[in-house]
């Protein structure tokens, strides 16, 4: 057959759908690979062809669009399952072609089972809510295009296994779920079940997302350096190991990049010749505030090293701060037999 631009298997779009539920899957060619949409392609005489490879098989085969009740159908650039079955799992390919042009892409589709409490291997989107904010809403995701606007579906919301009814600060409002003055106890998995009629049949769409309550921007502060500080002096003799921790607290800030680094005499450790190692650890509070610790280590410190300036720096979207460590050379205690005896004029 003639050459076809093959975009390969697009694993970035690992599509997961629930068993026994409707699924509408758009051909990724028009969304991510080509510069024109389906309407343009169709009016230019291009045809969209679908085929698939079953799970654990190598053979590509056409999709059967003649199943009872049109269980699988195609509409424009969308492949429809009404509903899915477990053995629909596989790699699906959409190909756009005419006599002179061809382009195709494959993508994996996984049909997933869920239990009565909506637990499943499905990867869940995470929605972050700010702690103590007034009203915040989550919306039942990925339900557009399943039914016309004239159809009024019923929507039921669940937290974990429990239907949300008379929850004090969580209020179902159709496709939205409102949280009033969110607390950490609102963390969890929330599921909306959308039920709608179509051609005398009833379909259910199940969508679960994880809510994570995080620190609020109104409480956010610039980075706070807890160590080094003015109370601790790193006093060492040459040959000893010098360990200086830089411990920094960062308020949670959406999409903020938190950075911690050391400078030695104003230079990054990589840019100087002394044998220095830096180890970093990160911990998070329940509201995703972050504490970063970078420990600067010089195995065998020299008297020159003890004269250098060691500064811990930190930066977030809220600002930049720096703090110098107090490093000094330990004055050796006098050895009585030599130094003191000399002081008394002994020979």
């Amino acid at each position: 057959s003639e050459r076809c631009d093959d975009w390969g298997l697009d694993t970035m779009r690992q599509i997961q759908v629930f068993e026994d539920e409707p699924a509408r899957i758009k051909c990724p060619l028009f969304e991510h690979f080509l510069k024109f949409n389906y309407s343009t392609a169709h009016s230019a005489g291009l045809t969209l062809i679908w085929y698939w490879t079953r799970q654990d098989r190598d053979l590509e085969e056409p999709i059967n669009f003649r199943l009872p009740e049109n269980r699988i159908s195609k509409e424009k650039d969308v492949l429809w399952f009404r509903p899915t079955l477990l053995n629909d799992t596989g790699n699906y390919t959409c190909m756009l072609r005419n006599t002179t042009y061809c382009s195709k892409v494959a993508f994996p589709l996984e049909v997933v089972q869920k239990d009565s409490c909506f637990n499943s291997p499905m990867k869940l989107p995470v929605h972050k809510l700010y702690i103590e904010y007034g009203i915040q809403r989550i919306t039942c995701p990925n339900v557009d295009g399943y039914f016309p606007s004239s159809v009024k579906p019923t929507i039921t919301w669940y937290m974990g296994c429990y239907k949300i009814q008379n929850f004090n600060n969580v209020i179902p409002e159709g496709m939205n779920l409102s949280f009033l003055i969110a607390l950490i106890s609102n963390n969890g998995n929330y599921t909306c079940v959308v039920t709608y009629p179509e051609n005398g049949r009833t379909f259910h769409l199940t969508r679960t997302l994880t809510v994570k309550v995080v620190g609020s921007p109104k409480n956010a502060v610039p980075p706070v350096i807890h160590s080094p500080n003015d109370h601790v002096v790193y006093e060492k003799e040459p040959g000893e190991e010098l360990l200086i921790p830089c411990t920094v607290y960062f308020s949670f800030l959406m999409d903020s990049r938190n950075e911690v680094w050391w400078t030695i005499d104003g230079k990054k450790p990589d840019d100087i010749t002394i044998d220095v190692t830096i180890n970093e650890s990160i911990s998070h509070s329940r509201t995703e505030d972050e504490t970063r610790t970078q420990i600067l280590s010089i195995k065998k410190v020299t008297s020159e090293d003890l004269k250098r300036s060691y500064v811990c720096h930190a930066r977030s979207a809220k600002g930049e701060v720096a703090k110098a460590a107090k490093v000094k050379q330990k004055v050796p205690a006098p050895r009585y037999t030599v130094e003191l005896a000399c002081g008394f004029g002994a020979t």
């Epitope: 702690i131 103590e132 904010y133 007034g134 009203i135 004090n168 600060n169 009033l180 003055i181 607390l183 950490i184 106890s185 109104k218 409480n219």
Partner: antibody, heavy 118, light 107 residues
Framework: EVQLLESGGGLVQPGGSLRLSCAAS????????AGWVRQAPGKGLEWVSA????????LYADSVKGRFTISRDNSKNTLYLQMNSLRAEDTAVYYC???????????WGQGTLVTVSS | EIVMTQSPATLSVSPGERATLSCRAS??????LAWYQQKPGQAPRLLIY???TRATGIPARFSGSGSGTEFTLTISSLQSEDFAVYYC?????????FGQGTKVEIK
């Protein structure tokens, strides 16, 4: 110094209304969530209502839901509690308090007495 | 709602002695528990938050412990000014709820 000063309490007949105010100073009121807690004579503490820092989110105890309304005016550093359809069992000292999720009710006013009696 | 139960209702202790107050939640409140002190005619005062962290200005003789459903407030050596009513309160879930109080009186 943090101060919360309630006012507006008094004697009211059953079915009547009263509006309590709480003037805040000594902290950034507009960044603070706040609420009302009451204490009936000789009894324990009961949470009544809470409001988010921006005034959008409001919550109520079941015992007052539909009758009481909490609000705030951040430009005046003032918290309010509008109490309608008052009942004898609403008789209590009403305290306003600042709350933060991390520290609960960390600052309290001195309280204002509401007496509902015919 | 979460029910908070305090025990004992009254605790008679001599000055200088140790006092141990208990608070139980009907379901887990994690470490989101506060203790308040209230003297007659006064507003409550925050003593402990986060189950074990002393609020600003609270003497070291007050300490809190516990997590989940069982909590304790300990006053290591009672001073005359410590005789009062003590309330626990959970702030894990709305509605926030208080215990019924423990009165610490002079023996």
């Amino acid at each position: 110094e943090v101060q919360l000063l309630e006012s507006g309490g008094g004697l009211v007949q059953p079915g009547g209304s009263l509006r309590l105010s709480c003037a805040a100073s000594g902290f950034t009121f507009e960044h603070s969530s706040a609420g009302w807690v009451r204490q009936a004579p000789g009894k324990g503490l009961e949470w009544v209502s809470a409001i988010s820092y921006d005034g959008e989110g409001t919550l109520y105890a079941d015992s007052v839901k539909g009758r009481f309304t909490i609000s705030r005016d951040n430009s005046k550093n003032t918290l309010y509690l509008q109490m309608n359809s008052l009942r004898a069992e609403d008789t209590a000292v009403y305290y306003c308090a600042r709350f933060r999720y991390y520290t609960a009710f960390d600052y309290w006013g001195q309280g204002t007495l509401v007496t509902v009696s015919s | 709602e979460i029910v908070m139960t305090q025990s004992p209702a009254t605790l008679s202790v001599s000055p200088g002695e140790r006092a141990t107050l208990s608070c139980r939640a009907s379901q887990s409140v994690s470490s989101n528990l506060a203790w308040y002190q209230q003297k007659p005619g006064q507003a409550p005062r925050l003593l402990i938050y986060g189950a074990s962290t002393r609020a600003t200005g609270i003497p070291a003789r007050f300490s809190g412990s516990g997590s989940g459903t069982e909590f304790t407030l300990t006053i290591s050596s009672l001073q005359s000014e410590d005789f009062a009513v003590y309330y626990c309160q959970q702030y894990n879930n709305w509605p926030w709820t208080f215990g019924q109080g423990t009165k610490v009186e002079i023996k």
